[in-house]
Interface confidence: medium
């Protein structure tokens, strides 16, 4: 708490200016207006104050606002956003989505703070839904943000919505998040061509169930290896050497790489190894020939 | 990538002026602060002041006021240190930084030196 | 002036050692504490600022803590370029202040 006292004679603060940066702590608090402060917090920025002088102008702010800061005053915060406890945010309501870019703005390039994740779950809560435009500023900001969403939380994003990803917001998905995305970006890529929407849909396979991958297989779409690796190994157990082959197309000869790696290990221990010959790769570890493969799982089914 | 580029060596003569360049390259040189800190040889660092360069807005240690003023060129992406009534006390390496980023004394310029000498 | 001391001047290391370097500040500086790192002819370098924030880029075997008037910067894993003088620093309030440096050299 910074103790009360006078103002000085003639130091009452008329406008935020760079006068109030040689402004000792306790003349800050005794000199300066909050409601003065409210209305001018966007000079705050321009002016070189000290940390330990921005907590003088927060303290003014929190007994200005105690039930939280309007969205004038906080679209206009600056780097005193860095000051902000995730208990100040949760009194706030932040429904502008500029707003939200302003603040991003001030913790950009750092990762994401106590601070910066609880304002952007406070404005995904107010606007019921991640939309589009939400999404966009909050990938460009965090690559890495809607795998930081847990799959409950991804449920609520809109299909329109995944136009917004790029392939890189992706790379730390799990998936359990891609068996959630994927339905939606199928959805949302439904009325592309071929190419076009296996260029869309790659990212997502992750989350693909096998006859997709079956349907895939029959549309000439060169799947790289890389994408292969990261598909569910329940969904690539079931396809057959074939249904590969048209998968992967020339991509195919990079299965001898990763023969020791999953799925492609799994899957070759499901193949019958005449059939895994007929790759001309040297795959091994298949079914000889002559053994009877049960079905396990469709017996499990029907019992 | 965020570069301070200092201006080079300097031999003066007491009771004489001297001004240190610091240019900065690799972002919006205007949105965030630049320190001045200062370093005698065999001693520690001392933070002279900071200049917002946006504003022009500046800030001294008390120590070094009537001694350093601090300015800046928006249009060179430069910020200037000029030492006046120089003594021997003064000689030193004056380092110029960035708070970029609005992380404290984030990147440092290479140095200058400075040698007060009859 | 808030004065920062660093107690160790010298500290004797190994490859491969867990080393903490201490700064002790003469009143509370509400975690506003960074560290630098400075090897001989070079400028100094911000690893660590609000006491526990790593810089961009700066290897995760460094971390910073504490709170109130004492704070520690934290080599997880010696490395031989770790090898440098170290500074911690107060931001929180001018005239910023810096310790006078500990200096890490091999056993």
């Known amino acids: 708490e910074v103790e009360k006292t006078a103002c000085p004679s003639g130091k009452k603060a008329r406008e935020i200016d760079e006068s109030l940066i040689f402004y000792k702590k306790w003349e800050l608090e005794a000199c300066v207006d909050a409601a003065l402060l409210a209305t001018q917090m966007d000079r705050v920025n321009a002016i070189p104050f000290t940390y330990e002088q921005l907590d003088v102008l927060k303290h003014k702010l929190d007994e200005l606002y105690p039930q939280g800061y309007p969205e004038s005053v906080i679209q206009h915060l600056g780097y005193l956003f860095l000051k902000m406890s995730p208990e100040d945010i949760r009194k706030w309501n932040v429904t502008s989505l500029e707003t939200l870019k302003a603040l991003l703005e001030v913790n950009k390039g750092h990762e994401m703070s106590p601070q910066v994740a609880t304002l952007i779950d406070r404005f995904v809560k107010g606007r019921g839904q991640l939309d589009k435009d939400t999404l966009d500023t909050l990938t460009a900001f965090y690559p890495g943000y809607l795998c930081s969403l847990s799959p409950e939380e991804l449920s609520s994003v809109p299909p329109s919505s995944i136009w917004a990803v790029r392939p890189q917001d992706l790379d730390t998905c799990d998936p359990r998040q891609l068996d959630v995305l994927y339905p939606k970006a199928r959805l949302a890529f439904q009325n592309m061509n071929g190419s076009e929407y296996f260029v869309k849909i790659q990212s997502f396979l992750g989350g693909a169930p096998t006859e997709d991958l079956k349907a895939l297989s029959q549309q000439n779409v060169s799947m790289d290896l890389a994408t292969f690796m990261k598909l569910r190994t329940d969904a690539v157990l079931p396809l057959t050497v074939a249904e590969v082959q048209k998968l992967l197309g020339p991509h195919v000869e990079g299965l001898k790489a990763e023969e020791r790696h999953r799925p492609v290990r799994d899957w070759i221990l499901r193949q019958r190894q005449d059939d895994l010959d007929t790759l001309g790769l040297g795959l091994q570890g298949g079914i000889p020939n002559g053994y009877l493969v049960l079905d396990l799982s469709m017996q499990e089914a029907l019992s | 990538q965020v570069q301070l580029q200092q201006s080079g060596a300097e031999l003066v003569r007491p009771g004489t002026s001297v001004k240190v360049s610091c240019k900065a390259s690799g972002y919006a040189f205007t949105n965030y602060l630049i320190e001045w800190v200062k370093q005698r040889p065999g001693q520690g660092l001392e933070w002279i002041g900071v200049?917002?360069?946006?504003?022009?807005?500046?800030k001294y240690n008390e120590k070094f006021k009537g001694k350093a003023t601090l300015t800046a060129d928006k249009s060179s992406s430069t910020a200037y240190m000029q030492l006046s009534s120089l003594t021997s006390e003064d000689s030193a390496v004056y380092f110029c930084a960035s708070d970029y980023d609005y992380d404290p004394f984030a990147y440092w310029g290479q140095g200058t030196l400075v040698t007060v000498s009859a | 002036d808030i004065v920062m001391t660093q107690s160790h001047k010298f500290m004797s290391t190994s490859v491969g050692d867990r080393v903490s370097i201490t700064c002790k500040a003469s009143q509370d500086v509400s975690t506003a504490v960074a560290w630098y790192q400075r090897k001989p002819g070079q400028s100094p370098k911000l690893l660590i600022y609000?006491?526990?924030t790593r810089h961009t880029g700066v290897p995760d075997r460094f971390t910073g803590s504490g709170s109130g008037t004492d704070y520690t910067l934290t080599i997880s894993y010696m490395q031989a370029e770790d090898l440098a003088l170290y500074y911690c620093?107060?931001?929180?309030?001018?005239?910023?202040?810096f310790g006078g440096g500990t200096k890490l050299e091999i056993k």
């Open positions: 620093q107060q931001h929180y309030s001018t005239p910023y202040t």
């Open positions: 200049i917002n360069p946006g504003s022009g807005g500046t």
């Open positions: 609000w006491a526990s």
